[in-house]
């Protein structure tokens, strides 16, 4: 079982130094060190923070079921419970078939798996919509055209790694929330730099989370409860070097939907996070569709 | 547009000094890492080291730590290479390149400048 | 460190041949890969980054797969201009090593 004991403080000095300065410092990559201030994890301060057991972290990339890991705060031991023995990824010979018809509106049932992203749910046409709360926005090194041109492979691929289905959230007039990227600029910037036209250096995608069938699969506990639970598990894979993910990330985070929605109570660190997943996973429940809409 | 212009080298005998420049244009120079990368003679690329002209921080290829040294001049935008104790298999083109956010592949090099170290 | 060794480190081809140039990492680097061409006497350019995305301007004949250790460079089909150079480079940690390069000449 994972110790309860302090993790050291940061044994580096340098580390301080080194914190926040867009390189992965491998010596200051540790949780003492903040992941290096969020460099190495795709700047989430600490993807383990709600997590009351304090070693799980090292025991996130064993490939081992540690049970007191398990938790949705715990970031699920990186799935290592929940995978049975069965194939954590989705089979080669589909992936790129699964990649381009994600979505597409027919339902291919070898992709419909948790593994594959579940088809993009054209499995699950008459099964209700169940979205986590808040907004996953992901900001990553690619412009909006080119990124958008490959936007089923994206898709596909991130709700693999989440185990659950991702879609773009639209805007009032229905088009994909992906904007342009700029380099945040300094507020007391000289007037000539302040000229130069802005680089668009990425996108900023919006994401949201339905967990229709990851509720429905028959180990339902894994589901992400808000996008920030999902952005923190982004965080935890690439604080390892675990996150196989073809498309370069700056940054993840979870926003509240505007209007920003009332707080839950109990939301404070370690419980805090099961509460509210163990709530909300009954309302899902109860609101949830009849058996004869799942699809295996 | 961005540009990355490289000046200072030339003919140094082994055991001198010389001070490579890259003067920096088209871009907000803070916000990326900038890098020396080197070539010899009918070889292959070597990274050498960079900076973040923003923090000051800078990491090194451990062959040159303790000779060479990486500066930066934000008033000019420009970047610095400071090589001491040259040897004749420091003989090589020198480029300078801006490393991309997070990741530092290298989309803009400057056209590089000659160091030849011989007596 | 990590080492990068590619392979092979010279080749010969004809136009409209399918080249492919091997780098591997002697440790895992996940995506953290680039590919550049050069030619004699001018600087590198930017191909491929993060292992599979082509960078603004880069014809869809070059293409980069691979994952962890094991990485690719393809061009599906060999033109005049593509006789250079190439190099892969690791990314993301410091040292950002180089590959040795692999010179694609003329058959």
């Known amino acids: 079982a994972p110790e309860v004991s302090e993790e050291p403080r940061c044994p580096r000095a340098a580390c301080q130094a080194k914190r926040g300065d867009q390189r992965c410092d491998r010596e200051c990559n540790s949780p003492g060190c903040g992941w290096d201030g969020g460099d190495c994890s795709l700047s989430v301060g600490d993807p383990w923070r709600q997590c009351e057991a304090l070693q799980c972290w090292r025991l996130f990339n064993n490939s081992r079921c540690d049970p007191a890991c398990s938790s949705p705060a715990c970031l699920y031991d990186n799935f290592d419970c929940h995978a049975g023995g069965r194939e954590r990824t989705c089979n080669p010979v589909y992936e790129k078939y699964c990649a381009d018809h994600f979505a597409d509106g027919r339902c291919d049932q070898g992709c419909n798996t948790e593994e594959c992203g579940w088809d993009g749910l054209d499995c699950a046409s008459e099964v209700p919509a169940l979205l986590a709360r808040g907004v996953l926005v992901l900001t990553v090194l690619l412009p909006p055209e080119e990124l958008l041109r490959s936007s089923a492979d994206f898709l596909q691929r991130l709700s693999a790694i989440l185990r659950t289905s991702l879609r773009f959230r639209l805007d009032a007039h229905g088009q994909a929330m992906v904007f342009p990227y700029h380099r945040p600029s300094p507020g007391s910037e000289p007037r000539a730099r302040r000229e130069l036209a802005p680089e668009v250096i990425g996108s900023v995608v919006m994401l949201e989370i339905d967990n229709r069938l990851c509720l429905q699969s028959p180990e339902n506990d894994h589901c992400f409860p808000d996008a920030q639970s999902a952005a923190d598990y982004l965080g935890a894979l690439s604080a390892v070097e675990r996150l196989d993910f073809p498309y370069p990330l700056r940054d993840v985070r979870g926003e509240p939907l505007e209007p920003p929605e009332p707080s839950v109570p109990g939301g404070g660190s370690g419980g805090g996070l099961n509460d509210i997943f163990e709530a909300q996973k009954i309302e899902w429940h109860e609101g949830g569709p009849p058996h004869h809409h799942h699809h295996h | 547009e961005v540009q990355l212009v490289e000046s200072g080298g030339g003919l140094v005998q082994p055991g001198g000094s010389l001070r490579l420049s890259c003067a920096a244009s088209?871009?907000?120079?803070?916000?990326?890492?900038m890098t020396w990368v080197r070539q010899a003679p009918g070889k292959g690329l070597e990274w050498v080291a960079e900076?973040?002209?923003?923090?000051?921080?800078?990491n090194f290829n451990e062959k040159f730590k303790g000779r060479f040294t990486i500066s930066v001049d934000n008033a000019k935008n420009s970047l610095y290479l400071q090589m001491n104790s040259l040897r004749a298999e420091d003989t090589a083109v020198y480029y300078c390149?801006?490393?991309?956010?997070?990741?530092?592949?290298?989309?803009?090099w400057g056209q590089g400048t000659l160091v030849t170290v011989s007596s | 460190d990590i080492q990068m060794t590619q392979s092979p480190s010279s080749l010969s081809a004809s136009v409209g041949d399918r080249v492919t140039i091997t780098c591997k990492a002697s440790?895992?680097?996940?995506?953290?890969i680039a590919w550049y061409q050069q030619k004699p006497g001018k600087a590198p350019k930017l191909l491929i980054y993060?292992?599979?995305n082509r960078y603004t301007g880069v014809p869809s004949r070059f293409s980069g797969s691979g994952y962890g250790t094991d990485f690719t460079l393809t061009i599906s089909s060999l033109q005049p201009e593509d006789f250079a150079t190439y190099y892969c480079?690791?990314?993301?940690?410091?040292?950002?090593?180089f590959g040795g390069g692999t010179k694609v000449e003329i058959k």
């Open positions: 480079q690791r990314l993301y940690n410091s040292p950002f090593t």
């Open positions: 088209g871009y907000a120079f803070t916000d990326y890492w």
């Open positions: 440790q895992n680097v996940g995506n953290n």
């Open positions: 993060y292992a599979s």
């Open positions: 900076i973040s002209p923003n923090s000051g921080g800078t």
């Open positions: 390149a801006r490393g991309e956010i997070r990741y530092n592949w290298f989309a803009y």
